[in-house]
């Protein structure tokens, strides 16, 4: 139970830290203008990952897509990358998830197999969360790196006469949300890794029980072993035990539902 | 069509108190900020400030902070500009305007004349 | 504040002249955003309000004739009148339109000979 409720809970955290990760590359507001020295701007600008806006007080919004490919800062093509790699492998990482599910039944799979995609869809999970806070934090140090560059040549003037002021950018809601939902990505890829460890625990190492029948001593070893007689290889009265359809050379085998001793 | 109609002439003894009046009509009146202009005789435009019809926040010049203050009527769409204590040097021609595109002032008023004389 | 200077204050021209008047603001009203110029022309005729002319320096506001042209970037601001008319007899003014508060220039007053 404690098993489903962890792989359940890790599915549902992973999918709002996706929605989030989604959300935050889309949104327009990676960095926004400095109000610091000025809290009531006439003119506000904001970029994201795909294009810059500009607000005016009048309520009249424009944005500009960025459409050169070429003419972009390496930094930002390789936020973008981030930022995608971890969309694509948190979309497929939640494909794989939802046919983990234990609570889920799709037609005879068995737990092993849901172990290995509960496993796979968590590092996955992980992997897309890393990505989304590597992304972000590579944007929020160029924006940092930025910040004090403008701020050291805040004001350029001819000849002290008239002043340019440099627009300066700051943190944009985008980049919380995509620490958050990189977090809870990350968080939901732990938990459903977690989940994989309680679907499939280690193997039990019991020691062969002989039960001591009248004629032949037959030894039963647990587990999908096969078992064999005590003495010689009297075929007659071999015994196949296999709890499930799992080859005799598995690494690994995991007791199923109807392994009891 | 776009309209702002403002209240008509006032005549005030210093020290007192006016509200002027600003009317609009023919746009979502919550939708575009209200600017209001100076006009003394002989002299040029003068910018008093602005009031966010949304959020019903203002924006004051230095030289207007204090004695002017901007409200709100917005289910009948007024905007209202009150000035107390006032001075001699606030006699003056008062425009409303609509903030627009461009954080211009696309629509205006028909102006309110406002005389102080003791 | 961004300090707007007009120049000249007065001019006395004849219809169909051409006509420049200059407006200077003491910060650049480029906004690096959208690469727009927040600069604003006025045109105020006796007894009347005001009257919008030219938004982001060089965009003609509907239904002003076409011999009104702004131009200029950053702090040099330029009015042109191609053919001036009788009706044109007004003060112009420029505003700053990037920053608040949105101040004016002096104005320039346009007198017929």
């Known amino acids: 139970m404690a098993v489903t409720a962890c792989q359940g809970l890790g599915f549902v955290v992973s999918l709002i830290g996706i929605a989030g990760i989604i959300a935050a590359t889309c949104m327009d507001q990676w960095s926004t203008q400095d109000l610091y020295n000025n809290p009531v701007t006439a003119v506000f600008n904001y970029q994201g990952l795909w294009r810059s806006c500009v607000r005016e007080s009048s309520g009249f919004t424009e944005c500009r897509g960025y459409f050169t490919l070429l003419g972009l800062p390496a930094m930002l093509q390789a936020v973008r990358a981030l930022m995608i790699v971890g969309i694509v492998l948190g979309a497929i990482g939640l494909l794989v998830s939802i046919f983990a599910l234990k609570c889920i039944r799709i037609g005879s799979m068995e737990d092993s197999a849901k172990a290995n995609m509960t496993l796979t869809s968590g590092i996955m999970f992980i992997v897309s969360g890393l990505c989304a806070i590597a992304g972000v934090s590579v944007f929020a140090n160029m924006l940092v790196t930025n910040f004090w560059m403008s701020t050291a040549n805040m004001y350029t003037g001819m000849g002290g006469m008239v002043q340019t002021v440099q627009t300066r950018y700051t943190f944009g809601a985008a980049l919380f949300v995509g620490w958050v939902a990189g977090g809870l990505t990350l968080i939901g890829g732990v938990m459903m890794c977690i989940a994989c460890r309680g679907l499939a625990p280690e193997e039990t190492n019991y020691k062969a029980v002989s039960y001591h029948a009248s004629g032949h001593s037959v030894a039963y070893k647990p587990g999908g072993f096969k078992a064999s007689t005590g003495f010689g290889s009297n075929t007659k009265n071999k015994k196949i035990y296999d709890g499930g359809a799992r080859t005799e050379d598995e690494v690994q085998s995991y007791p199923s539902k109807h392994d009891y001793v | 069509q776009i309209q702002l109609v403002q209240s008509g002439p006032e005549l005030k003894k210093p020290g007192e108190t006016v509200r002027i009046s600003c009317k609009a009509s023919?746009?979502?009146?919550?939708?575009?900020?209200m600017q209001w202009v100076q006009k003394m005789p002989g002299k040029g435009l003068k910018w008093i400030g602005w009031i966010n019809t949304h959020s019903r926040v203002p924006n004051f010049a230095e030289d207007f902070k204090g004695r002017f203050a901007f409200s709100l009527e917005t289910s009948a769409r007024i905007a209202y500009l009150q000035i107390s204590n006032i001075k001699n040097e606030d006699m003056a021609t008062y425009f409303c305007?609509?903030?627009?595109?461009?954080?211009?002032?696309?629509?205006w008023g028909q102006g309110t004349s406002v005389t102080v004389s003791s | 504040d961004i300090v707007m200077t007009q120049s000249p204050s007065s001019l006395t021209v004849t219809v169909g002249e051409k006509v420049t008047m200059s407006c200077k603001s003491s910060?650049?009203?480029?906004?690096?955003?959208?690469?727009?110029?927040?600069l604003t022309w006025y045109q105020q005729k006796p007894g009347q309000p005001p009257k919008l002319l030219i938004y982001w320096a060089s965009t003609r506001e509907s239904g002003v004739p076409d011999r009104f042209t702004g131009s200029g970037s950053e702090t040099d601001f330029t009015l042109t009148i191609s053919s001036l008319q009788a009706e044109d007899l007004a003060v112009y003014y420029c505003?700053?339109?990037?920053?608040?508060?949105?101040?004016f220039g002096g104005g320039t007053n346009l007198e017929i000979k």
């Open positions: 910060q650049s009203l480029l906004n690096s955003g959208n690469q727009k110029n927040y």
């Open positions: 305007a609509r903030l627009g595109k461009g954080n211009t002032m696309d629509f």
């Open positions: 023919g746009y979502t009146f919550t939708t575009a900020g």
């Open positions: 505003q700053n339109s990037y920053s608040f508060p949105l101040t």
